[in-house]
Amino acid sequence: QAAPFPELCSYTWEAVDTKNNVLYKINICGSVDIVQCGPSSAVCMHDLKTRTYHSVGDSVLRSATRSLLEFNTTVSCDQQGTNHRVQSSIAFLCGKTLGTPEFVTATFCVHYFEWRTTAACKKDIFKANKEVPCYVFDEELRKHDLNPLIKLSGAYLVDDSDPDTSLFINVCRDIDTLRDPGSQLRACPPGTAACLVRGHQAFDVGQPRDGLKVVRKDRLVLSYVREEAGKLDFCDGHSPAVTITFVCPSERREGTIPKLTAKSNCRYEIEWITEYACHRDYLESKTCSLSGEQQDVSIDLTPLAQSGGSSYISDGKEYLFYLNVCGETEIQFCNKKQAAVCQVKKSDTSQVKAAGRYHNQTLRYSDGDLTLIYFGGDECSSGFQRMSVINFECNKTAGNDGKGTPVFTGEVDCTYFFTWDTEYACVHHHHHH
């Protein structure tokens, strides 16, 4: 049987059940190569409390549909009077990056995971030439996830003192220049994730090969190498390589630019101080507030919730958007869709789409940007579920009793962007990270 998601085959992936201190290793096309789980384990469970290993999915006993992958075992469950077997179930949803498998829950018999990934999309519009896993768990099983830094088009400019060259990078993925035909970036060779531009020439100095690595709790490393055998004439016979070290800052701060810290014989070392290198619980919340010792900040957007069936309305030219954030109040137009953001076509108000649901909510504060994300909305033709990204700005003189109002700024591939100036986005900082 052919592998259902070949892009995911090259790596062994990890997921964590934080509540029970369990680390899962997943290889969807082969085996995870952990002796304690046996030679054919596709999903290996490591219980760190009991220091035991169990195979909870066998690569030989795999069944697949377009959106679901199941690995059975021959091990009976502990449920009395049943002949169920232990199994793992991975539900796949379309995402804009390779993404990460997320542990959902485990019953006596079944270990459930969800994975938003380009590999599950109906169309190839989000697929990269080359992309590698962009997250890692540290020794405390805390997740560090650089997926939000991945640019689907364009690149980051590396701060370099050399006026004659420009070094562009993407994170975990090659640089896509198709959306900007006029810039210097257009000359970059396909597949490159690190592109050096000198005058009118552009050179591939690195492509992603291995996934993100953790070197210390707050330092992550990504390595790019030039795959082609042909040497560049300005590299003195060496093969180009790029090492990007992502550093979690010691306290809250605005984002910084990736900086070139060393350069020798086409070996480029880059340091990027960014809060995205910190563990995810430091940056994100599933509620509308971020506070406490762990986050170093106090943010509470819950006063923005609307009661009594009213919603914020944002005009998007062809569409009206109805928003009801930080609550579970149904939007009238989007009845029964559990939408936090509802898109209604002006010319035909029967055309209604959920652009993100209130139980699929993430509040993120990273590198000085405060963002509320609603995902899991109605599907677009690509298979991607509509989502909304609301970028908040602190404004102590905002109207509407300080609440302000969301403004639609545009749509990119079924992701809807809004900005919202409000006094409730004014962040209070603590200092003890």
């Epitope: 364009g154 420009s166 006029g182 810039s183 970036l185 605005e254 545009g410 900005t419």
Partner: nanobody, 123 residues
């Protein structure tokens, strides 16, 4: 690709003010960063100010810091350059530009450009 159209240029006395506008049409991707550049006769095009579309992070050339302010109105797909305390050396054609490169002020990294609007500051 995005199309850009500047307006608001003109003749002004030293110490005066002008507000330039740049309207974006086509697909105004949120991945774009937006910049103002200027080019005086016989000189190279130089960076003036930049802003992220998805947030209000800004950067300025040292020569205009404290005098110029870049802003955006997302509802109108428009960016602005408010120019105060104008000096004769601010005389130039001002261009609006869009880039898919983060953290750049280099004009060659901007792929979409407007036609420009003339600003003349007399002494």
């Amino acid at each position: 690709q995005v199309q850009l159209q500047e307006s608001g240029g003109g003749l002004v006395q030293a110490g005066g003010s002008l507000r330039l506008s740049c309207e974006a049409s086509g697909r105004t991707f949120n991945t774009y960063n937006w910049g103002w550049f200027r080019q005086a006769p016989g000189k190279e095009r130089e960076f003036v100010a930049a802003i992220r579309w998805s947030s209000s992070k800004t950067s300025y050339a040292d020569s205009v810091k404290g005098r110029f302010t870049i802003s955006r109105d997302n509802a109108k797909n428009t960016i602005y350059l408010q120019m105060n305390s104008l000096k004769p050396e601010d005389t130039a054609v001002y261009y609006c530009a869009a880039s898919i490169v983060d953290f750049t002020t280099n004009p060659s990294h901007f792929g979409s450009w407007g036609q420009g609007t003339q600003v003349t500051v007399s002494s």
